[in-house]
């Protein structure tokens, strides 16, 4: 999938499997990824595990899990709240849209996030105090923790060479993440496709075009547009926003 | 103990919330206070020892006297904005302070600095 | 996370005194009533007395009447069982839990009465 | 004072099997409102008691939904649906609706 980090940095990760997305003294979040099509690296999420943990007088531990076509509108013990404490309202999930979109909000941590099922797949969003994004009891320890340190290097799909390729009159396949790119979806397509939801040429706007090139599918367009979106309503610099492309950096050294 | 559940229906049922209520509005105002005051009895049981069950006593006693209503009389429907939906078994509602992280952690300081992550697509 | 440690148990003969203390976190003490339970060994649990959240009431069980005082410090997050006139029968785990009707227990002390 | 009376005093069950423990009162645990306020406490061997329900029915928060409670006046029940391996302990009832508030002798569950 692709990965906004706390740091603004925007990257493309095979990340197959079970990995941390977020893990502080607060609250734990890890995601499942799938590959898209069989034998392609690149993956999207098929599951998502929220726990969070137990905190003072406000709310007990409350786990939130939500799969492919599963999108709950409630913790995994059916509640709607953080349980029998006082502060038990500082956790509460609403439901945005019925097996689409739920939006977490945890107060106590002033914390809001937003899960949403697009198509076949999960999007993952969240706003959240640089005080509790660093709320961490072992600094060292934390070294996969995807939203702040980023994918690793090995984990990384260079998605901006692989637009050279797919830019280029004959695409090889070979160069694709995918060894099933699908034909039916030409180049100028997944740009029509991507810009018609996506007007600004962003890295939003470039992701959707990789996926449909990628995947021929085309909810990953509504997949980015709604990235986008939930980035709209919980970054608190809209200055950033919109990410471009920047000169090579070394992934994975986000911290 | 459930006292926040009456206090948080006390709030929802006045509209104007914890300021005065205009002269027409009291009889309303002290129905809900009958209300409130109902709800708080019914908890004694369960929150006699805590400190928001004698708040809400001594804060409904007050509010009785500064706005002339009477121990008896009609009591009202509270139009509940926020509480959990009837299924669900969880029904505490107002928070402590620290359970409300902007007023919690940044009482002496400016507002804290927010970040985004997100993840989607392939 | 509420946590209620309990301390001060011990052996001690009939007739002779001891005084119990609980260390509370993970939520404001000062806003609760407080607690104490016992249960004797292989037996069932006893519910001793409770104190309110700022020690302007207290209730006991007619077992422990005239004998056992709650008192608490709310500044040092402590809630106290000072137990007198011990007798065999006292002899039990000691249990401090929190609210006016206990939600959340310690893991207890023990109280052993025996000459 | 209020005695609470629970049977059976010993309880083998069959794992996934359904389990069910009455309490009763000796006078009703219903208030002039109309609320009733008794509730059960599970006791794992070794631990702490860890309250289940309030309110005769209310579970308390992180409790499995295979527990449930019930039961109006003197008679009340603790129900679980599917006993799991977990649920060993001794189960207590507890009526805080009058003073002293008093705790039933406790039933034993073990698995058979």
């Known amino acids: 999938p692709h990965l906004r980090t706390f740091t603004d940095h925007f990257q493309t990760c095979k990340v197959q499997g079970a990995w941390p997305l977020i893990d502080n003294n607060y609250l734990n979040v890890q995601v499942t990824n799938t590959p898209v099509l069989p034998g392609s690296a690149a993956t999207a999420t098929s599951k998502l595990t929220i726990i969070f943990k137990n905190f003072q007088e406000c709310v007990d531990q409350k786990v939130y899990q939500a799969e492919m076509d599963e999108l709950p509108s409630a913790f995994a013990d059916g509640s709607k709240n953080g349980g029998d404490k006082h502060g038990a309202n500082s956790l509460k999930i609403t439901e945005k849209v019925s097996g689409q979109h739920v939006e977490i909000q945890a107060k106590y941590i002033g914390t809001t996030i937003v899960v949403r099922q697009v198509g076949r797949y999960l999007t993952f969003a969240v706003r959240m105090p640089e005080e509790v994004v660093n709320a961490v009891e072992d600094r060292d320890s934390q070294g996969l923790y995807l939203c702040l340190r980023g994918c690793p290097l090995n984990q990384q799909i260079d998605f901006q060479a692989f637009r050279a390729n797919a830019e280029s009159p004959r695409r090889p396949a070979a160069a694709s993440p995918s060894p099933v790119v699908p034909e039916t979806f030409p180049y100028e397509t997944a740009v029509a496709k991507c810009k018609e939801k996506l007007p600004v040429e962003d890295l939003y706007y470039q992701a959707c075009v990789f996926d449909l090139l990628t995947t021929g599918d085309v909810n990953f367009t509504l997949a980015a547009y709604y990235a986008l979106e939930d980035g709209k309503m919980l970054h608190s610099n809209k200055d950033k926003l919109h990410l471009f492309e920047r000169t090579r950096e070394l992934p994975g050294a986000v911290a | 103990c459930k006292i926040l559940k009456c206090n948080s229906e006390f709030w929802s049922a006045t509209s104007s919330g914890s300021h005065a209520p205009a002269s027409d509005d009291v009889p309303e105002f002290c129905a809900a206070l009958r209300t409130y005051a109902l709800c708080t009895r019914r908890t004694a049981r369960t929150c006699r020892g805590d400190l928001a069950y004698h708040s809400a006593v001594h804060g409904i006693e007050d509010l009785m006297s500064q706005h002339n209503c009477s121990k008896d009389g009609p009591t009202s429907q509270p139009r509940v904005r926020t509480l959990p939906p009837a299924g669900d078994s969880q029904e505490r509602s107002d928070s402590p302070e620290i359970c409300h992280y902007e007023k919690s952690f940044h009482k002496h300081s400016a507002a804290p600095n927010y970040t985004h992550c997100g993840l989607f697509g392939d | 996370e509420v946590q209620l440690v309990e301390s001060g148990g011990g052996l001690v003969q009939p007739g002779g005194s001891l005084r119990l203390s609980c260390a509370a976190s993970g939520f404001t003490f000062s806003n609760y009533g407080m607690n104490w339970i016992r249960q004797a060994p292989g037996k069932g649990l006893e519910w001793i007395g409770m104190i309110y959240y700022d020690s302007s009431e207290k209730h006991y069980a007619d077992s422990v009447k005239g004998r056992f005082t709650i008192s608490r410090d709310n500044s040092k997050n402590t809630l106290y069982l000072q137990m007198n006139s011990l007798r065999a029968e006292d002899t039990a785990v000691y249990y401090c839990?929190?609210?006016?009707?206990?939600?959340?227990w310690g893991q207890g002390t023990m109280v052993t009465v025996s000459s | 004072d209020v005695v609470l009376t629970q049977s059976p005093l010993s309880l083998p069950v069959t794992l996934g099997q359904p389990a069910s423990i009455s309490c009763r009162s000796s006078?009703?645990?219903?208030?002039?409102?109309?609320?009733?306020?008794l509730e059960w406490f599970q006791q794992r061997p070794g631990q702490s008691p860890r309250l289940l329900i309030y309110e005769v029915s209310t579970r308390f928060s992180g409790v499995p939904d295979r527990f449930s409670g019930s039961g109006s006046g003197t008679d009340f029940t603790l129900k679980i649906s599917r006993v799991e391996a977990e649920d060993v302990g001794v189960y207590y009832c507890f009526q805080v609706t009058h003073d002293p508030m008093t705790f039933g002798q406790g039933t034993k569950l073990e698995i058979k």
């Open positions: 006078q009703s645990l219903e208030t002039s409102d109309g609320d009733t306020f």
């Open positions: 839990a929190k609210g006016t009707t206990p939600d959340y």
